[in-house]
């Protein structure tokens, strides 16, 4: 029997060890500079890493600019957006601005985007000083299903800031659903 | 096999509990203010609690004004820091202000520092106003190997909030590295 | 002993499941905004939703204003508090604003109420503009004791977004205490 | 990488006037507090003046109250040092520096508490 429930307990070992990786998909996305679409309207940003620097994924996939749910669960999302402007790199088109970063989800079965999260800030990015930066942070709880998907969309993309440790967003699944 | 199987069930529910534990480090570090550098440039803030108020920490270690991973895994990492200035303090020597914070991560092995984390915003803070206050939040998952350590940076340190409801940083690990 | 090996492995396969998610409050609650105070003072807010749209709890309790603490553990609070004025809603009292958050932790037992987290910034909204939007976030890792309870405080509640990606608050459990 | 330039220095007669421009490039906050120093042959380092970030406030060493003026422009860079009523022993290498601390302090007018030194102009005022 001593036998027996070594073999239990190895087995079991091995079960809770494998079920707990497999059960907490997540993903840490970061920004991809060479593809941010101009203009200052709110538009879906597409293009980020997810697989050098501080990017991975696991357990999720990124398709088509989104980051796609495989495994129901509860999600903690997050999103970190800095933009920032130098006067080296011309005259704003208008010094009032409205910085926004939007994290949505959307559902393919029944086709429809909702907003999850929002933040950000009006700001006056005057001409009296040449050096212009702020950044956002959002995070919350969330019940996803598999399929889901979770975007990003932001307000005026040509200012974000390229840096990996900048403009990012993820998710990790803390629990099942029950 | 009755007697047996309780047996089992017994030690895995030790065993379990104790694994779970054991796998889930955690901080929660609050500026002590009594030791914050004065200047306008980034300075590294080597000076946090860590067993007092909110402050804690388990299967981490705080040395040398850094947070020292212990156990690899996945870590959600974050921080808090609050700036604010009263005209009881003193004179400003610039009212343009750019007021950050950097989470980085310095691996021993490599003698190397990154950032993981940035955020903040320049600021413009008038004499028209006797009060002014900014707070900034970042956050982010991160896969960390025993032995990195976590170091917060920040602009303008004389501006912090001391409180430990206001600056703040803090990590708890999510799951292990596969 | 095969039989009992089976048996014993799926009994342990539903305590895992079951204690897993027994162990594993949250809480996500979204702003009611049907009864928002009026002024620029501080104030408590109470009103929220648990159980429409994106607002949910479990293994918690929401009762007169605050979230209820039903299960020790340390957990991962946040909170997003997003305010805005547009001109069509008449003249601030103050172009000088304080737009902060308070999260606080309150215990029945020793009735005190202490501040967790705080952020916020001073912000001059000025007549130049038409429209104003700022927003906060804060998050960071507590011990919470069963019956302890979490509420939110902010100045100028009338400035409040009332929609619910924008104002909310939660929690969830990342691990038991020792 | 931070560079502070100065330029504008030159020969010019005793009670003559020049203007000094200190440029900042590399770092993305010129707005800062700036400081002029300036060192004659074999002595050391003299404070001139010392202007805020945005301009409103200024203070000048005792030797060249009432003669030199610290100005900026409004779109932040260059900083300026108005030199007038020029005396020989005003002949010196002038330097601008960015002043290191957040608040403005007793210290201001100490060298050690500015960063990013340029080369200098150097200034002779003879006749």
């Known amino acids: 029997i001593r036998a027996e429930k070594a073999m239990v307990d190895g087995s079991w070992l091995d079960l809770a060890k494998r079920s707990k990786l497999e059960a907490q998909p997540f993903a840490h996305l970061t920004i991809n500079a060479t593809d941010i679409p101009s203009g200052s309207h709110k538009v879906s940003l597409s293009s980020w890493y997810h697989d050098r620097g501080w990017a991975k994924i696991s357990n999720m996939t990124f398709s088509n600019g989104k980051l796609i749910v495989n495994q129901d669960g509860f999600y903690y999302l997050y999103a970190n957006i800095c933009f920032r402007h130098h006067e080296t790199s011309g005259d704003l088109a208008t010094e009032y601005l409205q910085l926004m970063v939007y994290v949505t989800k959307t559902s393919i079965k029944i086709p429809s985007s909702h907003t999850l999260m929002k933040g950000g800030s009006t700001k006056y990015w005057s001409g009296n000083s040449e050096f212009h930066f702020y950044s956002i942070n959002v995070g919350g709880f969330f019940k996803l299903r598999s399929g889901e998907e979770i975007s990003i969309e932001v307000s005026n993309p040509s200012l974000l800031d390229p840096d990996q440790d900048a403009t990012y967003f993820g998710a990790f699944k803390v629990r099942d659903i029950d | 096999i009755r007697a047996e199987k309780a047996m089992v069930d017994g030690s895995w529910l030790d065993l379990a509990k104790r694994s779970k534990l054991e796998a889930q480090p955690f901080a929660h570090l609050t500026i002590n203010a009594t030791d914050i550098p004065s200047g306008s440039h980034k300075v590294s803030l080597s000076s946090w609690y860590h067993d007092r108020g909110w402050a804690k920490i388990s299967n981490m270690t705080f040395s040398n004004g850094k947070l020292i991973v212990n156990q690899d895994g996945f870590y959600y990492l974050y921080a808090n820091i609050c700036f604010r200035h009263h005209e009881t303090s003193g004179d400003l020597a610039t009212e343009y202000l750019q007021l950050m914070v950097y989470v980085t991560k310095t691996s021993i092995k490599i003698p190397s520092s990154h950032t993981l984390m940035k955020g903040g915003s320049t600021k413009y803070w008038s004499g028209n106003s006797e009060f002014h206050f900014y707070s900034i939040n970042v956050g982010g998952f991160f896969k960390l190997r025993s032995g990195e350590e976590i170091s917060i940076e920040v602009s303008n340190p004389s501006l912090l909030d001391p409180d430990q409801d206001a600056t703040y940083f803090g990590a708890f690990k999510v799951r292990d590295i596969d | 002993i095969r039989a009992e090996k089976a048996m014993v492995d799926g009994s342990w396969l539903d305590l895992a499941k079951r204690s897993k998610l027994e162990a594993q409050p949250f809480a996500h609650l979204t702003i009611n905004a049907t009864d928002i105070p009026s002024g620029s003072h501080k104030v408590s807010l109470s009103s929220w939703y648990h159980d429409r749209g994106w607002a949910k709890i479990s293994n918690m309790t929401f009762s007169n204003g605050k979230l209820i603490v039903n299960q020790d553990g340390f957990y991962y609070l946040y909170a997003n508090i997003c305010f805005r004025h547009h001109e069509t809603s008449g003249d601030l009292a103050t172009e000088y604003l304080q737009l902060m958050v308070y999260v606080t932790k309150t215990s029945i037992k020793i009735p005190s109420s202490h501040t967790l987290m705080k952020g916020g910034s001073t912000k001059y909204w000025s007549g130049n503009s038409e429209f104003h939007f700022y927003s906060i976030n804060v998050g960071g890792f507590f011990k919470l004791r069963s019956g302890e309870e979490i509420s939110i405080e902010v100045s100028n509640p009338s400035l409040l977004d009332p929609d619910q990606d924008a104002t909310y608050f939660g929690a969830f459990k990342v691990r038991d205490i020792d | 990488e931070v560079q502070l330039v100065e330029s504008g220095g030159g020969l010019v007669q005793p009670g003559g006037s020049l203007r000094l421009s200190c440029a900042a490039s590399?770092?993305?906050?010129?707005?800062?507090?700036m400081g002029w120093f300036r060192q004659a042959p074999g002595k050391g380092r003299e404070f001139v003046g010392f202007?805020?970030?945005?301009?409103?406030?200024?203070y000048y060493g005792e030797s060249v109250k009432g003669r030199f003026t610290i100005s900026r422009d409004n779109a932040q860079n260059p900083v300026y040092l108005q030199m007038n009523s020029l005396r020989p022993e005003d002949t010196a290498v002038y330097y601008c520096?960015?002043?290191?601390?957040?608040?403005?302090?007793?210290?201001?007018?100490?060298?050690?508490?500015?960063?990013?030194w340029g080369q200098g102009t150097l200034v002779t005022v003879s006749s």
């Open positions: 520096g960015v002043y290191r601390r957040t608040y403005i302090s007793s210290t201001y007018s100490e060298s050690s508490e500015y960063d990013y």
């Open positions: 590399g770092f993305t906050f010129s707005r800062s507090a």
């Open positions: 202007i805020t970030g945005s301009g409103g406030t200024t």
